[in-house]
Interface confidence: medium
Amino acid sequence: CSCAPTHPQTAFCNSDLVIRAKFMGSPEIIETTLYQRYEIKMTKMLKGFDAVGNATGFRFAYTPAMESLCGYVHKSQNRSEEFLIAGRLRNGNLHITACSFLVPWHNLSPAQQKAFVKTYSAGCGVCTVFPCSAIPCKLESDSHCLWTDQILMGSEKGYQSDHFACLPRNPDLCTWQYLGVSMTRSLPLAKAEA
């Protein structure tokens, strides 16, 4: 299974549901289907209120039963560990794959945690995080923000994914905007130096 790198904002915007939840145990194979399901305990819903309607929560996360079909394999044995899960809604059920944005909540930077709760939503449907695969990259539209973490950091985990969101600057322009939470190392040019 091959997954394209995803900026957290893209994961948020492209998902039907974004929740915080704990995994309660091993997966259960669903007979006669190619799916298995993990029992989860949802602690907070961050996106999907409209899609879910009056449902009170999700007890299961469904995923393909085989890794070759991009099935998600949950490796942590810690049932008290909280995860951020960005998934799709199918037939009223939460579906995830190996490519889903699914990470321990505490692994997210404070800026990302804040953004998942309230900031990323402001860019959905308006702004696009545009991955840069070779320098120089070209912005195809003023509603795009160039995402350069992969080429400069060799990973999708970099300054832009950790500390920036692509948000509307005005009705015709989206730009990277600093999420304003202190960082462990100084960010080049993100603040004035006295």
């Epitope: 840069c132 320098i135 120089p136 070209k138 912005l139 003023d142 923000c145 160039l146 350069t148 080429i151 400069l152 950091m153 060799g154 300054y159 832009q160 500390h163 920036f164 600057r169 322009l173 730009t175 990277w176 905007q177 600093y178 100084s186 960010l187 080049p188 040019l189 993100a190 603040k191 004035a192 130096e193």
Partner: antibody
Framework: QVQLVQSGAEVKKPGSSVKVSCKAS????????ISWVRQAPGQGLEWMGG????????NYAQKFQGRVTITADESTSTAYMELSSLRSEDTAVYYC????????????WGQGTLVTVSS | DIVLTQSPATLSLSPGERATLSCRAS???????LAWYQQKPGQAPRLLIY???SRATGVPARFSGSGSGTDFTLTISSLEPEDFAVYYC?????????FGQGTKVEIK
Amino acid sequence: QVQLVQSGAEVKKPGSSVKVSCKASGGTFSSYAISWVRQAPGQGLEWMGGIIPIFGTANYAQKFQGRVTITADESTSTAYMELSSLRSEDTAVYYCARGYIPYHLFDYWGQGTLVTVSS
Amino acid sequence: DIVLTQSPATLSLSPGERATLSCRASQSVSSSYLAWYQQKPGQAPRLLIYGASSRATGVPARFSGSGSGTDFTLTISSLEPEDFAVYYCQQFNDSPYTFGQGTKVEIK
């Protein structure tokens, strides 16, 4: 195609100031960092400082702190570098260069502006 | 400040030969933050390599970069006439974002 077009050559007296402009076209000005790099005759490259237009705040190399001011005007997609208290050793070609936020990797450069400081 | 020391200062080679340029940092630099530029007389620098080893768009395959930590190398596998120029390494790991003093590759 991205272009950075700088203002023309300047001759200045010691103690005076110079302000060089850098007008960007062909790209989204606000989505990048603009840095200034200088090169004295026959010498290497020296980063002076830079600005991210959407933040409006700049940072500077310690060497130039207090003498250089970098600003940006989003409405005209133009960045400016002003250097004060000029001395003869400030004679150099001054380049503006575009970098990806929040990185200082310069993929496009202006043509350079020669500033000569002479009495 | 991170000091980048390039060697040799001048490299005299003939077209078709291999050029190996060195850049040594005074302290460790993440390879993600190391770039190489080419500058010809009267022109602005041109980005060649970023992330220590990735070629910028339009840069011929004869240019390659390698290294990590404090030692980085730019290699030109077979010099073409247009490759004779000055080459600079740059770090953008920490402010101020410093350049090496340059290596001039000249025709022998």
